[in-house]
């Protein structure tokens, strides 16, 4: 029961996390114009991974995509890649985990298969979450670096005066969404990995099944063939089920419901 709950909760948390990663990737507010201690401008700028937007005080908003690949910073391209990898891995993880859920029965899928699938999806969620956290952190680092490099100046040029407004950009809402979403996906993945341990079937050993023949002198060979003297009913060599390697404890035969007397 606890395993099912852990697995189910892990799935839900990861689902919310991946939805958050997708939302963050699509959001326009990765960086927003820093208005603190800035000259008054007529607009408010904010940018996403795919386009930049300008909002006027009247509410009029204009967004424009980055119609270039080469003109963009390598760091931005890296962030895009990390977020997309995170989404893809997360989506595959979700797909795998749906079939791995203990509460969902698909044909005669064994618990061991479900355990493996749960572990696989868990690892995928962990990597997905790490990709999102890494992507957002790289972007945040880029913002911090650019923030302290920006300057403002004023000079007189041809045809009048020019003033460079100190346009600095700070953390946008998408960064916080990304960090939280990545964290949730990571937590969900860890929960799936924990659930996997509970799902893995404990080895039930019926390795030394004793067939008691009516003959007098019966030699018992654990795990191999039952050697008979030739007297009584057991004239054929009967193969005893052997699950594989045995520990010292398993050498002796334990009575079970399969014992025939």
């Amino acid at each position: 029961m606890a395993v099912t709950a852990c697995q189910g909760l892990g799935f839900v948390v990861s689902l919310i996390g991946i939805a958050g990663i997708i939302a963050a990737t699509c959001m326009d507010q990765w960086s927003t114009q820093d208005l603190y201690n800035n000259p008054v401008t007529a607009v408010f700028n904010y940018q996403g991974l795919w386009r930049s937007c300008v909002r006027e005080s009247s509410g009029f908003t204009e967004c424009r995509g980055y119609f270039t690949l080469l003109g963009l910073p390598a760091m931005l391209q890296a962030v895009r890649a990390l977020m997309i990898v995170g989404i893809v891995l997360g989506a595959i993880g979700l797909l795998v985990s749906i079939f791995a859920l203990k509460c969902i029965r698909i044909g005669s899928m064994e618990d061991s298969a479900k355990a493996n699938m749960t572990l696989t999806s868990g690892i995928m969620f962990i990597v997905s979450g790490l990709c999102a956290i890494a992507g957002v952190s790289v972007f945040a680092n880029m913002l911090v670096t650019n923030f302290w490099m920006s300057t403002a100046n004023m000079y007189t040029g041809m045809g009048g005066m020019v003033q460079t407004v100190q346009t600095r950009y700070t953390f946008g809402a998408a960064l916080f969404v990304g960090w939280v979403a990545g964290g949730l996906t990571l937590i969900g993945g860890v929960m799936m990995c924990i659930a996997c341990r509970g799902l893995a079937p404990e080895e039930t050993n019926y390795k030394a099944v004793s067939y008691h023949a009516s003959g007098h002198s019966v030699a018992y060979k654990p795990g191999g063939f039952k050697a008979s003297t030739g007297f009584g009913s057991n004239t054929k060599n009967k193969k005893i089920y052997d699950g594989g390697a045995r520990t010292e404890d398993e050498v002796q035969s334990y009575p079970s419901k399969h014992d025939y007397v």
């Epitope: 930049s52 300008v54 460079t164």
Partner: nanobody, 122 residues
């Protein structure tokens, strides 16, 4: 760089009208705001009227109802229609624009023209 060229200034009688025009040329990028500032002798430069790309207008109190600003984004021009002129409107009128670069990490620049003289006198 953006170059702003004003025209339309001159001498006019009180109660008269003038139309100032300004043409922007060069790397105009996205012109967030276009408008007019003025500076009377011995006074600070003051904002007269501005118009954003979205069409929002802003006027100085003394100009509201008398002055009308308009802009043509296709031609990157801005005009100021001044009616019922008063002697206190006498000043050098400067064309102004706030421009920003497009694409990643937009930077904002303010540009002013060299000015055109408006004299209101009888």
């Amino acid at each position: 760089d953006v170059q702003l060229q004003e025209s339309g200034g001159g001498l006019v009688q009180p109660g008269g009208s003038l139309r100032l025009s300004c043409a922007a040329s060069g790397s105009t990028f996205r012109m967030n705001v276009m408008g007019w500032y003025r500076q009377a002798p011995g006074k600070q430069r003051e904002l007269v009227a501005t118009m954003t790309k979205g069409g929002s207008t802003n006027y100085i109190d003394s100009a509201r109802g008398r002055f009308t600003i308009s802009r043509d984004d296709a031609k990157t021009t801005v005009s100021l229609q001044m009616n019922s002129l008063k002697p206190e409107d006498t000043a050098v009128y400067y064309c102004y624009t706030e421009v920003q670069t497009t694409g990643w990490n937009p930077q904002i620049y303010n540009y002013w023209g060299q000015g055109t003289q408006v004299t209101v006198s009888s």
